[in-house]
C-alpha cells in the first residue's frame, strides 16, 4: 500500500549510486535548450548625441543545448550525509532551432565602455580612459556578433588599458570549459526531507553579496525538492545565474505527458520593491537608480560580478516599475511568454518540465569625463538579451515514470 | 579628519636624486588618485602627474616624464614622489594633493621645499 | 595639450569692490574649470570646482561662470582676507594645466 510506496519513494530519492534519482542527477535524461532573443538598438547615434529613448527589436530564438555535461568531482561525505560536485558548463549553437547564425550581427550597448565610469568612478581614472576610448575609436553603441556578444570578444579600448585587466568582454564570459560550483548538497539519506537541499556553495553557506538573510543559500537547484511535495509548500532554490536564493509557489495542475504535475511559478512580489515587500528591502542595495528603493523588477548584481554594473530582471522588463522600462521602446511583457515556471511531479519532488526566463541588462549613466557618455541626461538600465531556458521530459522516461511511480500509487 | 603630512625639505646635489613622501590618513587611501605638483618660487603650478593607489596606475605629463617616479605604499597609506638628474631647474616647492571622487585636488599636503644646489 | 591663459597678471582692489578674473583655454573643455585661492606659505585651497560648483564651506561671495573655451572667477565683494593668488585649472583632458595665476592685493 501507501507505505510502500512511500519507502520506495524514501529509497529512490536518494542521492546515492544506484538510486532513480542519482542516475539522473548526475547527467540528467532532459535535453535542455537556451533560447536567446538579443534587443537591437535601433537608434544609436539619437541616443549618445540626445538622450532619447532607447528603441530596439528583438531578434531571436538562437538556441543553445546546454547542461547535456554530467557533473564532474562528485564526492559522498558520510559523516554529513552530503554529496559535493560541480556542474561543468557547455553550450553547443543548434541552427535549427534557431533564426539565424552565431555570425549574425547586433547593435548593443558597448559593455566596457559602459561599465568603465561604473567601476572606476574617480574623475582623474575616467579621464585617462576616455583617451583610449576616442583612440580606440569605441563609443557607447557597437555592433558584434551573437558569438561575440555571448561568449566574449578581444575589447579594443580594454586592450589599451596599460595595467593587468581581462580584455575579453562576453555577456556570459567565460562559459564553455568552465564550471558552476562547488555545490554540497545533502543526499537524504538521513533525512528525505533534506534531500537535494544546498549545505554549501563555493565552500560557504551564505553568498557575501547581500546583507542579512537576502545573503543565504536557501533550497535546492531547483531539478528536485525534497519528496511529498504539497500545493502549499513555497519551493525555494538558489540560482547562481541571479546570485540569490528565490521561490516558487503553486500556481495550477498539469498533466505532462500523463503525469500529473504541479506548475510552481515565481510571484511578482518576489521581484517586489521593499515597499510593497518588505522581505525585499535588503535586496535594494543602492538608492540613487533604485529611485529610494522604490523601483521594482530589476536587480543589481553587481556585487556578484565584479563590480560590473548589470541588472537582472524578467524579460521585457515584465513585473517591473514603469521608470525602469519608460526609457526603453519596444518592448512588450508578457506573463506566458515571459515567467518562469517549474513543473515538479509532487511524489518525487522531481522537476520534470521548466522554463527559467531571465534578461541580462547593463546599467549605462552620464560620466561627463567619458565623452561618448557626457551627452547622456540619465541613466538607462539597457535591456542586452533575455533568455528562456527549457526542459522537459522525454517521452520514454515519462513513460518509464508513469510506470514506476505514478502507475503504481493508481 | 583628512590629512596629508609631506616629508621635510631637502637640500640636494645636482645630479642626485630625491624621494618625497606624502603620508595619508583619514580616508581609504587607495580609493583617490595622488597628485603631485610643481611650484617654482613665484611661479605657477605645474601638474606632474597621478597615480590611482588601487591599481598602482600612473599619468605623467610628458613634461615630466624620466624626471619624476610616482609610487605608493598601500600599507601604510603613503604615496612618493622621487626625482632624478636634479638641476637647478628643479628647485621649486613640491606639493601632493588627493582627488575627491569628481573633485580635482580637494586636499593638498603641506609642501616640501626641494633645494638643489652644489 | 590645453593651454590656459589667465588674466590679469595682478589686481589691485579696494575693499568692497568687484573682482574678476578671466581664463580662456585652447580648446573647449565644456565646463570643466576649477578655481584654488593660495595664500602665502600655504598649499592652494580648492574654491570652485567643476561645474561652477562651489565648495562647501566657501564664502558665496565667490563664484565663476562660463562654458568651452571663456571662463570668469568673480569675488562679489572683496574683503582683505581675499588677498591672495588665484589658480584656475581645466580638468578636461591629461596634462591637467593650470592658468599663469593672478595676485589679487588690497587697494
Known amino acids: 500500500g501507501d507505505m510502500l510506496i512511500e519507502k520506495t519513494i524514501k529509497r529512490e530519492v536518494v542521492l546515492e549510486e544506484g538510486t532513480t534519482a542519482f542516475k539522473n542527477w548526475v547527467k540528467t535524461g532532459t535535453t535542455v535548450y537556451r533560447q536567446f532573443w538579443i534587443f537591437d538598438v535601433q537608434n544609436p547615434d539619437d541616443v549618445a548625441k540626445n538622450s532619447s529613448k532607447i528603441k530596439v527589436k528583438q531578434r531571436g530564438p538562437y538556441t543553445y543545448r546546454v547542461r547535456y555535461l554530467a557533473k564532474e568531482n562528485i564526492t559522498q561525505d558520510p559523516e554529513d550525509h552530503t554529496v559535493s560536485f560541480v556542474q561543468p558548463n557547455g553550450a553547443i549553437f543548434e541552427p535549427s532551432l534557431s533564426v539565424g547564425t552565431e555570425d549574425d550581427n547586433f547593435t548593443v550597448l558597448n559593455l566596457a565602455v559602459a561599465a568603465a565610469p561604473h567601476i572606476y568612478q574617480n574623475s582623474f581614472v575616467q579621464v585617462v580612459l576616455n583617451s583610449l576610448i576616442k583612440k580606440s575609436k569605441s563609443s557607447m553603441f557597437q555592433t558584434r556578433s551573437l558569438k561575440e556578444l555571448l561568449w566574449g570578444y578581444k575589447d579594443p579600448f580594454l586592450s589599451l588599458v596599460p595595467y593587468p585587466i581581462s580584455t575579453t568582454v562576453g555577456v556570459f564570459y567565460p562559459y564553455n570549459d568552465t564550471v558552476d560550483g562547488v555545490y554540497k548538497v545533502f543526499n537524504g539519506k538521513d533525512n528525505i526531507s533534506k534531500v537535494a537541499i544546498i549545505e554549501s556553495y563555493k565552500g560557504k553557506r551564505n553568498l557575501s553579496y547581500w546583507p542579512s538573510y537576502c545573503d543565504m543559500i536557501n533550497g535546492t537547484d531547483a531539478a528536485s525538492f525534497p519528496p511529498f511535495v504539497e500545493k502549499s509548500r513555497t519551493l525555494r532554490f538558489f540560482s547562481s545565474d541571479i546570485c540569490r536564493s528565490i521561490y516558487a509557489v503553486f500556481g495550477s495542475e498539469i498533466d505532462l505527458k500523463g503525469i500529473p504535475v504541479y506548475r510552481f511559478v515565481l510571484p511578482a512580489n518576489a521581484f517586489a520593491s521593499p515597499l510593497q515587500n518588505p522581505d525585499n528591502h535588503c535586496f535594494c542595495t543602492e538608492k540613487v537608480i533604485s529611485n529610494n528603493c522604490t523601483s521594482y523588477g530589476v536587480l543589481d548584481i553587481g556585487k556578484c560580478k565584479e563590480g560590473k554594473p548589470v541588472y537582472i530582471s524578467l524579460p521585457h522588463f515584465l513585473h517591473a516599475s514603469p521608470d525602469v522600462s519608460e526609457p526603453i521602446e519596444g518592448l512588450h511583457p508578457n506573463e506566458d511568454e515571459h515567467r518562469t515556471y517549474l513543473d515538479v511531479e509532487p511524489i518525487t519532488g522531481f522537476t520534470l518540465q521548466f522554463a527559467k526566463r531571465l534578461q541580462v541588462n547593463i546599467l549605462v549613466k552620464p560620466a561627463r569625463k567619458i565623452e561618448a557618455l557626457k551627452n547622456l541626461k540619465r541613466p538607462y538600465i539597457v535591456p542586452i538579451l533575455w533568455l528562456n531556458e527549457t526542459g522537459t521530459i522525454g517521452d520514454e522516461k515519462a513513460e518509464m515514470f508513469k510506470t514506476q511511480v505514478t502507475g503504481k500509487i493508481k | 579628519q583628512i590629512q596629508l603630512v609631506q616629508s621635510g625639505p631637502e637640500l640636494v646635489k645636482p645630479g642626485a636624486s630625491v624621494k618625497i613622501s606624502c603620508e595619508t590618513s583619514?580616508?581609504?587611501?587607495?580609493?583617490?588618485?595622488m597628485h603631485w605638483v610643481k611650484q617654482s618660487h613665484g611661479k605657477s603650478l605645474e601638474w606632474i602627474g597621478g597615480?590611482?593607489?588601487?591599481?598602482?596606475?600612473?599619468k605623467y605629463n610628458q613634461k615630466f616624464k624620466g624626471k619624476a617616479t610616482l609610487t605608493v605604499d598601500k600599507s601604510s597609506s603613503t604615496a612618493y614622489m622621487e626625482l632624478r638628474s636634479l638641476t637647478s631647474e628643479d628647485s621649486a616647492v613640491y606639493y601632493c594633493?588627493?582627488?575627491?571622487?569628481?573633485?580635482?585636488?580637494?586636499?593638498w599636503g603641506q609642501g616640501t621645499l626641494v633645494t638643489v644646489s652644489a | 595639450e590645453t593651454t590656459v591663459t589667465q588674466s590679469p597678471a595682478s589686481l589691485s582692489v579696494a575693499t568692497g569692490e568687484k573682482v574678476t578674473i578671466r581664463c580662456i583655454t585652447s580648446?573647449?573643455?565644456?565646463?570643466?574649470m576649477n578655481w584654488y585661492q593660495q595664500k602665502p606659505g600655504e598649499p592652494p585651497k580648492l574654491l570652485i570646482s567643476?561645474?561652477?560648483t562651489l565648495r562647501p564651506g566657501v564664502p558665496s561671495r565667490f563664484s565663476s561662470g562660463g562654458y568651452g573655451t571663456d571662463f570668469v572667477f568673480t569675488v562679489e565683494n572683496m574683503l582683505s582676507e581675499d588677498v591672495a593668488d588665484y589658480y584656475c585649472?581645466?580638468?578636461?583632458?591629461?596634462?591637467?594645466?593650470f592658468g599663469a595665476g593672478t595676485k589679487l592685493e588690497l587697494k
Open positions: 594633493a588627493r582627488d575627491r571622487y569628481d573633485v580635482w585636488f580637494a586636499y
Open positions: 583619514g580616508h581609504t587611501f587607495t580609493e583617490y588618485t
Open positions: 597615480i590611482y593607489p588601487n591599481n598602482g596606475a600612473t
Open positions: 580648446t573647449d573643455i565644456d565646463d570643466d
Open positions: 567643476e561645474g561652477n
Open positions: 585649472l581645466q580638468s578636461d583632458n591629461l596634462p591637467l594645466t
